[in-house]
Interface confidence: low
Amino acid sequence: YDFTNCDFEKIKAAYLSTISKDLITYMSGTKSTEFNNTVSCSNRPHCLTEIQSLTFNPTAGCASLAKEMFAMKTKAALAIWCPGYSETQINATQAMKKRRKRKVTTNKCLEQVSQLQGLWRRFNRPLLKQQ
């Protein structure tokens, strides 16, 4: 999906008002020194591409993020503010239902959500120079 035509300010508002809290809740009790941010993004469409990938694509050691509150709110924000996004996700959602897994918070998931927080921070500050 090409995120170029999304309403970035509306997505930012959704993050600021709710998604950020859910990410903090998920990471509660985790020390900042545990993870290094290795995923970055260069502009807002790129950030949303990376956020979508980390949030919804199962990875080795973390298959359960899509059912978390922050993921559901992220999905809703993208569906509302990115034209045509919902249609691209129908097949992916059906595939996910078939392989639904028990929700488990693993260290790998915590690391992944830590990366997500970094991506969201970057998304919210598009004018900042790349570190």
Epitope: M27, Q117, L128
Partner: nanobody, 127 residues
């Protein structure tokens, strides 16, 4: 549930002092890289960033309008961030909010645009 509760506001005469507190529950300031800050909104005006503190290294930043008068600090053992406000002026009258997961740097301290999580605490400077 993640919550921030602001307190310490009140009515004070010009030149007076107040100390605002922002207490967090549902998460721990010290546990993660959360930058924490204060912003304010005066009646009929836009919200403006006042000050923030980086949880990584304790660096602090202030809006030009409060530099030298306000001091931000944190007590991780109490999970609370404070804003000590001295030499208060009538133009400091506003509803003060704290926010977490802000971007604490010179670029952004005057641009906090987070939706308020708490109810805020009202500061009125008047003779």
């Amino acid at each position: 549930e993640v919550q921030l509760v602001e307190s310490g506001g009140g009515v004070v005469q010009p030149g007076g002092s107040l100390r605002l507190s922002c207490a967090a529950s549902g998460f721990t300031f010290a546990d993660y890289d959360y930058d924490i800050g204060w912003f304010r909104q005066a009646p009929g005006k836009e919200r403006e960033g006042v000050s923030c503190i980086s949880n990584r290294d304790g660096s602090t930043y202030y809006a030009d309008s409060v530099k030298g008068r306000f001091t931000i600090s944190r007590d991780n053992s109490k999970n609370t961030v404070y804003l000590q406000m001295n030499s208060l002026r009538p133009e400091d009258t506003a509803l003060y909010y704290c926010a977490v997961e802000i971007h604490c740097d010179d670029y952004g301290v005057e641009n906090f645009d987070f939706d308020p999580w708490g109810q805020g605490t009202l500061v009125t400077v008047s003779s």
